[in-house]
Amino acid sequence: QGGTRSPRCDCAGDFHKKIGLFCCRGCPAGHYLKAPCTEPCGNSTCL
């Protein structure tokens, strides 16, 4: 109960990581994160 956690993301495909509450698809190279996804394994909003 006391240990830290490094949650992995069990999502289809690659490039998902925990951003905020959810596992989100990261932004492509050259883009930056505007907003994280709002559902499990969702797409971040990138600019």
Epitope: G2, G3, R8, D10, K18, L21, E39, P40
Partner: antibody, heavy 122, light 111 residues
Framework: EVKVVESGGGLVKPGGSLKLSCAAS????????MSWVRQIPEKRLEWVAA????????YYPDSVKGRFTISRDDARNTLYLQMSSLRSEDTALYYC???????????????WGQGTSVTVSS | DILLTQSPASFAVSLGQRATISCRAS??????????IHWYQQKPGQPPKLLIY???NLESGVPARFSGSGSGTDFTLNIHPVEEEDAATYYC?????????FGSGTKLEIK
């Protein structure tokens, strides 16, 4: 022993403000996402705010967006809920809840405090 | 928002029998291979207690007489055999998307 203890509830007039606190112990607070959930006696539970661990993203339902602000102080192992522009419908028992840990985020809430009561009335 | 409808609202079950509680979602709560439904038990004057997460996973310390099943929009919590201490209100919750919502609750009484 994992423990979360809420405080700060009370009687406030409509339009007023209140700040709730939740003191956590028995686990590495900074590693867990946290939520506030409220309940009108004998009624449905309503999730009102969440904050992520590490990057501190915050989330709210439309019913409280712009009026409530969730925050955390990992150094003090404390979660907060700043409530403003309070309405009579915000009257409820407010629970602090830890999101379940594990290999990946699951968003179930595994430890809850006893709650702190908020009454909005003139 | 996803609406969770629980049935029945309340019922009574004899000691040792099976109790079945239904939770129906207004849209699918399944994605990425998981069904994002969780079950809680709440007794009067106490906070909710997590029983089952992700539809069928028993939380640590919860007796094996509790089980969960379902997929898509229809989910079930089973308690068998029912014991006196199981008298409580049971809630389902989804985490498929924001906002997280809870069912309206099912009150279980023991005969």
């Amino acid at each position: 022993e994992v423990k979360v203890v809420e405080s700060g509830g009370g009687l406030v007039k409509p339009g007023g403000s209140l700040k709730l606190s939740c003191a956590a112990s028995g686990f590495v607070f900074s590693s867990y996402d946290m939520s506030w959930v409220r309940q009108i006696p004998e009624k449905r539970l309503e999730w009102v705010a969440a904050i992520s661990s590490g990057d501190y993203y915050t989330y709210y339902p439309d019913s409280v967006k712009g009026r409530f602000t969730i925050s955390r102080d990992d150094a003090r192992n404390t979660l907060y809920l700043q409530m403003s522009s309070l309405r009579s419908e915000d009257t409820a028992l407010y629970y602090c809840a830890r999101h379940r840990g594990g290999n990946y985020p699951q968003y179930a809430m595994d430890y809850w405090g006893q709650g702190t009561s908020v009454t909005v009335s003139s | 928002d996803i609406l969770l409808t629980q049935s029945p609202a309340s019922f009574a079950v004899s000691l040792g029998q099976r109790a079945t509680i239904s939770c129906r979602a207004s849209k699918s709560v399944s994605t990425s291979g998981y069904n994002y439904i969780h079950w809680y038990q709440q007794k009067p004057g106490q906070p909710p207690k997590l029983l089952i997460y992700l539809t069928s996973n028993l939380e640590s310390g919860v007796p094996a007489r509790f089980s969960g099943s379902g997929s898509g929009t229809d989910f079930t919590l089973n308690i068998h055999p029912v014991e006196e201490e199981d008298a409580a209100t049971y809630y389902c919750q989804h985490s498929r998307e924001l906002p997280f919502t809870f069912g309206s609750g099912t009150k279980l009484e023991i005969k």
